[in-house]
């Protein structure tokens, strides 16, 4: 309500190599699993660094005044705006993990607010009105979260909270199961 920005800089959330979260485990089944046990390539980081920026979740820092009608905060507050793409960049062998990053289309991740912080601000009003105290909720950090498959678009799940990270030199073992027979479980998989 009446935000006014006058400063803007950005921070990119780019985890260190080897720390990029795998997508959440997907339900595998006989149809999709034709794993050659010894057919693996050496472990690689699932993203090429040159492409990471294209798919990074950015925290844009905005410094603004809080306004409420004619009243304005005595000092500006700094908050984050989440921006950017989330998802794998280049197809490298470890990228599949239990997710299917080799597919042409897959889980849609969005860069959205993760944590919020409350900040008390003092609003100065014109005409000799007494200053007002107001608590505002500001975005403190951003995160990649998935648009869930069978839920409303607004319900987003974390990108890597429960995600299995690749173990160096090892491939995740497949779990053969029927996805269609496990729809109730699938609904909660993300």
């Amino acid at each position: 309500q009446g935000w006014q920005a006058f400063k803007n800089d950005a921070t990119e959330i780019i985890p260190e190599l080897g720390e990029y979260p795998e997508p959440p485990p997907e339900l595998e089944n006989n149809k999709t699993m034709n794993r050659a046990e010894n057919g693996g390539r050496p472990p690689h980081h699932p993203f090429e660094t040159k492409d990471v920026s294209e798919y990074s979740c950015r925290e844009l820092h905005f410094t603004r005044y809080v306004t409420d009608g004619p009243c304005r905060s005595a000092k500006p507050v700094t908050e984050l705006v989440c921006s950017g793409q989330c998802g794998p960049a280049r197809l490298l062998p470890n990228a599949i993990g239990r997710g299917k990053w080799w597919r042409p289309s897959g889980p849609d991740f969005r860069c959205i607010p993760d944590r919020y912080r409350a900040q008390r601000v003092q609003l100065l009003c014109p005409g000799g009105e007494a200053p007002r105290a107001r608590k505002v909720r500001l975005v403190a950090s951003c995160k990649c979260k998935r648009l869930t498959r069978f839920h409303n678009q607004s319900e987003l799940k974390d990108f890597g909270t429960e995600a299995a990270r690749p173990q160096k030199g090892r491939k995740p073992r497949p779990r053969a199961r029927s996805a269609k027979a496990n729809q109730a479980e699938l609904e909660n998989a993300y």
């Epitope: 999709t32 034709n34 998802g87 794998p88 280049r90 042409p104 889980p107 849609d108 069978f150 491939k171």
Partner: antibody
């Protein structure tokens, strides 16, 4: 130049088999996941099957499951589609396509090979 | 019938902006990324948009993609005669466990 060239198409009777090949050049073959997509005459695109870099993950469309087998030979830079128990409705132009960007669409396509199933 | 629904045809005059829609469900567009392909007459398809709104190198910025809920759109601004083609949307479907295409939209430049 990145290139995919399909071959092996032809006229075949229902119930018979055919094997399609796709030869790749101009790029590092095993950096790409590969797929077969078909297009019946005058119709839209239909994804048939896909295979990951080393053939360790495979997917099929329900319409071909149990009849078609996708495979690849990275030493020969080749992708294959073994088509058994062919049906009239399998008649189409079969494209070989690839992607080397996770969830990034099929960014490399061949020109296609025609399969006609008719008695 | 295709899993993803597109209008069979669309048209516009040179310089105009045209939008092609693609409607799906929560198991495909709702939770997965959307790609768009252009197929010029007599040629193989070409990737136009990936991951909802990303353009591969070489694709003019006149082409843009967007997604909201279980629908996606392809917008072409500054329409040119060479844009006359069939356009397909596509996304992974988690129930069918397949990469599904829309039925295609034939774009005519008048």
């Amino acid at each position: 130049e990145v290139q995919l060239v399909e071959s092996g198409g032809g006229l075949v009777q229902p119930g018979r088999s055919l094997r399609l090949s796709c030869a790749a050049s101009g790029f590092t073959f095993d950096d790409y996941a590969l797929h077969w997509v078909r297009q019946a005459p005058g119709k839209g695109l239909e994804w048939v099957s896909g295979i990951s870099w080393h053939g360790d993950f495979i997917d099929y469309a329900d319409s071909v499951k149990g009849r078609f087998t996708i495979s690849r030979d990275n030493a020969k830079n080749s992708l294959y589609l073994q088509m058994n128990s062919l049906r009239v409705e399998d008649t189409a132009l079969y494209y070989c396509a690839g992607n080397n960007r996770g969830y990034g669409g099929l960014d490399v396509w061949g020109q296609g090979t025609t399969v006609t199933v008719s008695s | 019938q295709s899993v993803l629904t597109q209008p069979p045809s669309a048209s516009g005059t040179p310089g105009q902006r045209v939008t092609i829609s693609c409607s799906g469900s929560s198991s495909n567009i709702g939770g997965n990324t959307v790609n768009w392909y252009q197929q010029l007459p007599g040629t193989a398809p070409k990737l136009l948009i990936y991951s909802n709104n990303q353009r591969p190198s070489g694709v003019p910025d006149r082409f843009s993609g967007s997604k909201s809920g279980t629908s996606a759109s392809l917008a072409i601004s500054g329409l040119q005669s060479e844009d006359e083609a069939d356009y397909y949307c596509a996304a992974w479907d988690d129930i069918l466990e397949s990469y599904v295409f829309g039925g295609g939209t034939k774009l005519t430049v008048l």
